[in-house]
Interface confidence: medium
Amino acid sequence: DGCKDIFMKNEILSASQPFAFNCTFPPITSGEVSVTWYKNSSKIPVSKIIQSRIHQDETWILFLPMEWGDSGVYQCVIKGRDSCHRIHVNLTVFEKHWCDTSIGGLPNLSDEYKQILHLGKDDSLTCHLHFPKSCVLGPIKWYKDCNEIKGERFTVLETRLLVSNVSAEDRGNYACQAILTHSGKQYEVLNGITVSITERAGYGGSVPKIIYPKNHSIEVQLGTTLIVDCNVTDTKDNTNLRCWRVNNTLVDDYYDESKRIREGVETHVSFREHNLYTVNITFLEVKMEDYGLPFMCHAGVSTAYIILQLPAPDFRAY
């Protein structure tokens, strides 16, 4: 069908609550484009009827609420005047009862659900709520170990929980809760956040933390487009360089002629005492020579790699 495939990162989500994903790919969606969502390679688009539990809302796919059976690969097709891109998003839904410690830990949570507070400082946690304009979010409530937070050191500011004079006891499991209203119906959103405490490093001595990748392999088909984010937390005043390298060479230099593999533009989200940086690597077309090579994300003295590997053969197809 002439659409270029782009594989985005997995999203791990909690069942029985609203979830939304926005189909944006800045190089493409900045112009005049149409966006259509599909599930599991279905030829039938996701409904645009707002009464449907799963429906498309402008460029978003919206689940009201998400259910355990909604796991799967969703595609959004972005069609421009002269282009077509199909973005694949793998959604994994899990049943998590935040206050039931017997169920065990969470699966590999994304960086939004792992946050850091700095010992002895005033700092903040952020409740990440990404929904289309049609969803109205009420005031956020915060919980620690399933008890609502009401202490004198805590103040709520929009989507943030401000924490005064952070202490070691502030580490642990937090949750932020909001009531979402859509078409007159109300839903509860509850995000769990695992909080660790770090001492602020001295002058120039900060060690960045690479949240993702985690020295692992990624299965990817030959010939596809692949984008991988490197997510790094670091102090606000850091001077560390963040980049992707292969064979100890900057990817932009290594692939200078073909430009087949490129490093993206770095972005960051500012928290009170630290920044979350993202710099991606884009494989315009995965080639055989890319498999087995460690592609390294560097952040100051910290490094982490990904290795591309061919997917195992699917014998069910024969």
Partner: antibody
Framework: QVQLQESGPGLVAPSETLSLTCTVS????????VHWIRQFPGKGLEWIGV???????DFNAPFKSRVTISKDTSKNQVSFKLSSVTTDDTAVYYC?????????????WGQGTLVTVSS | EIVMTQSPATLSVSPGVRATLSCKAS??????VLWYQQKPGQAPRPLIY???YRHSGIPARFSGSGSGTEFTLTISSLQSEDFAEYYC?????????FGQGTKLEIK
């Protein structure tokens, strides 16, 4: 000891920009946030916004489009600007800082500066 | 936003008598409440933080109580210097909000 002092013109014409400076001493702006609060002639107090120790800012919703807060750490000064003023912005403007321990919210205040909006 | 409502607007009391000022929050703010005293031409002066703790240098005749939505400032035996305007403020949730004030005047 900790001190804050507001300065700026006492009279501003309608539709103009109100500009105030808060000069601090006894502490560093890299360690503490500075808040701006105003008090109307009818005595009511209203929180306007804050500049945090890292230089980021937050504002009360009605002010988001009109207020700018910045700071010059080397000069120990915080700058406050309120654009498109009307007579409703006539008030005493304060800068304030939290105390050094939790819960001790505005433990330190400037003396306040009366700003009258009039043509 | 959280609305803080103070009562009464004016309280006329004789020196040496106990004065009780009330402050109600429109939603639960825990104990994240402050009380200030303000005299004409001066900035507010913090008296009580966390609903019941006195700031340093505040005389023991000032006490605060309450949690959730109802708070009280009590001055056990009024001195002449206590006649002033009193404000409560919540810091549970931004925007930070203040009560409209109670004027304590000499009867």
């Amino acid at each position: 000891q900790v001190q804050l002092q507001e300065s700026g013109p006492g009279l501003v014409a309608p539709s103009e920009t109100l500009s105030l400076t808060c000069t601090v001493s006894g502490f560093s702006l890299t360690d503490y946030a500075v808040h701006w609060i105003r008090q109307f002639p009818g005595k009511g107090l209203e929180w306007i916004g804050v500049i945090w120790s890292d230089g980021s800012t937050d504002f009360n919703a009605p002010f988001k489009s009109r207020v700018t807060i910045s700071k010059d750490t080397s000069k120990n000064q915080v700058s406050f600007k309120l654009s498109s003023v009307t007579t409703d912005d006539t008030a005493v403007y304060y800068c304030a800082r939290k105390g050094g321990y939790s819960g001790s919210w505005f433990a330190y205040w400037g003396q306040g500066t009366l700003v009258t909006v009039s043509s | 936003e959280i609305v803080m409502t103070q009562s009464p607007a004016t309280l006329s009391v004789s020196p040496g008598v106990r004065a009780t000022l009330s402050c109600k929050a429109s939603q639960d703010v825990g104990t994240n409440v402050l009380w200030y005293q303000q005299k004409p031409g001066q900035a507010p002066r913090p008296l009580i933080y966390s609903a019941s703790y006195r700031h340093s240098g505040i005389p023991a005749r000032f006490s605060g109580s309450g949690s959730g939505t109802e708070f009280t400032l009590t001055i056990s035996s009024l001195q002449s210097e206590d006649f002033a305007e009193y404000y409560c403020q919540q810091y549970s949730r931004y925007p930070l909000t203040f009560g409209q004030g109670t004027k304590l005047e000499i009867k």
